[in-house]
Interface confidence: low
């Protein structure tokens, strides 16, 4: 580069490179200014005038210095199965992903494309391992001493209590009944429960596809209608 | 397009009811829908959504006392055993479909009136 | 739980003056905010989305505005047709919600 700041545009020397954030024009075969996270290029530089950006419209982004004649659509809203974990902004784009009692089946490069609910685990099992943002839930049956009889996520096989005289001898499912004796256990009584995150969505109930079926069409977040027209004024 | 409720009518308590609402010309498996009523000279109450995939969420107090389901072509709201504090105009409408600004309701039925007295 | 809280529950305004409706909510709903607006007989009309940006067909006498938990409805210019209840309705989540509608706002036009 010559001795002197360049303003931009201006013409790099043979073999040169432009600085950061610039970039080299190919039809004007200058270097440019780049325009800012947030913004595109409106208008492209010339010889004798630079770049000139204009701010993203609502629901597109540029997430970093760029000469894009547009910016990018955001992502269509989160489904009903996820939490937006980061807003579309003109910086950024939205992110989504499970809600807590779900966990990602089928990932995309930002955020999750099929959520899953997870499994529980049916009366007699226990959770073995603990669903994470990625996994599913692991059951296993309870061992002998052990029991659960909840249907749950998060509940883990619990020992039976210890009687003086046994009115009903427990099983996988069921917690040992004794004579009205007072028992003991030989654990920390009640149902032992994983932490689960809070939600900013109801928790539902309903049945999802299981994460082993082939992604269909029906799995992808859905690409919403075009916008609602503006009115008079518009922004 | 347009949405509009029927099955609305004068119910004892305690008897069953369910409220159908009619789309015409948008696809239920596009958009979400909603549920909302009116006591007489009362401010709007939201009883519950059926999202574009058919999961439902309710109001808190609406839970239990109202079901949300739905066809390739209605949305039905079942009050499962009505009071009299049930009396109300019930509208259904369909959310604006467009993912940047949240929730909102663009069409909106003309609301059918349930009636509860013995 | 989330809840939206509207104010004043009434209001009276003269033909060609302005009223400013506000809506609280309890938490911050990042702009998702809208307003309807509803006459005796008829279902509510969507005016606003967004916080600020105007539905199709509204006139442009009605603006919104606001972020984070507090969010206002400015009607300028107010015609006789402008007299009916307004509402504002949270667009941001539905779990632990009573209701995402404020209570309500009544517009008299003198």
């Known amino acids: 580069l010559p001795a002197q700041v360049a303003f931009t545009p201006y013409a790099p020397e043979p073999g040169g490179t432009c600085r950061l954030r610039e970039y080299y024009d190919q039809t004007a075969q200058m270097c440019c200014s780049k325009c800012p996270p947030g913004q595109h290029a409106k208008v492209f530089c010339t010889k004798t005038s630079d770049t000139v950006c204009d701010s993203c419209e609502d629901s597109t982004y540029t997430q970093l210095w760029n000469w894009v004649p547009e910016c990018l659509s955001c992502g269509s809203r989160c489904s009903s199965d996820q939490v937006e974990t980061q807003a579309c902004t003109r910086e950024q784009n939205r992110i989504c992903t499970c809600r807590p009692g779900w966990y990602c089946a089928l990932s995309k490069q930002e955020g999750c494309r099929l959520c899953a609910q997870l499994r529980k685990c049916r009366p007699g099992f226990g959770v073995a391992r603990p669903g994470t943002e990625t996994s599913d839930v692991v059951c296993k049956p309870c061992a002998p001493g052990t029991f659960s009889n909840t249907t749950s996520s998060t509940d883990i096989c619990r020992p039976h209590q210890i009687c003086h005289v046994v009115a009903i001898p427990g099983n996988a499912s069921m917690d040992a009944v004794c004579t009205s004796t007072s028992p003991t256990r030989s654990m920390a009584p009640g149902a032992v429960h994983l932490p689960q995150p809070v939600s900013t969505r109801s928790q539902h109930t309903q049945p999802t596809p299981a994460p082993s079926t082939a992604p269909g069409t029906s799995f992808l977040l859905p690409v919403g209608p075009s916008p609602p027209a503006e009115g008079s004024t518009g922004d | 397009q347009s949405v509009e409720e029927s099955g609305g009518r004068l119910v004892t308590p305690g008897t069953p009811l369910t409220l159908t609402c009619t789309a015409s010309g948008f696809s239920l498996s596009t958009y979400d829908m909603i549920w909302v009523r009116q006591a007489p000279g009362k401010g709007l109450e939201w009883i519950g959504y059926?999202?574009?995939?058919?999961i439902t969420d309710y109001a808190s107090w609406a839970k239990g006392r109202f079901t949300i389901s739905k066809t390739s072509t209605t949305v039905d709201l079942k009050v499962t055993s009505p009071t009299t504090e049930d009396t109300a105009t019930y509208f259904c409408?369909?959310?604006?479909?467009?993912?940047?600004?949240?929730?909102?309701?663009?069409?909106w039925g003309q609301g059918t009136l349930v009636t509860v007295s013995s | 739980a989330l809840v939206m809280t509207q104010t004043p529950a009434s209001v009276e305004v003269a033909v060609g003056g302005t009223v400013t409706i506000k809506c609280q909510a309890s938490q911050s709903i990042t702009n998702y905010l809208a307003w309807y607006r509803q006459k005796p007989g008829q279902p509510p009309k969507l005016l606003i989305y967004g916080a600020s940006k105007l539905a199709s067909g509204v006139p442009s006498r009605f603006s919104g505005s606001g972020s984070g938990t507090e969010y206002t409805l400015t009607i300028s210019g107010v015609q006789c047709d402008d007299a009916a209840t307004y509402y504002c309705?949270?667009?941001?989540?539905?779990?632990?919600?009573?209701?995402?509608f404020g209570g309500g706002t009544e517009v008299v036009v003198k």
């Open positions: 059926i999202w574009s995939d058919g």
């Open positions: 309705q949270q667009g941001y989540t539905s779990s632990n919600v009573d209701n995402p």
């Open positions: 409408a369909r959310d604006v479909g467009y993912a940047g600004y949240g929730y909102y309701f663009d069409l």
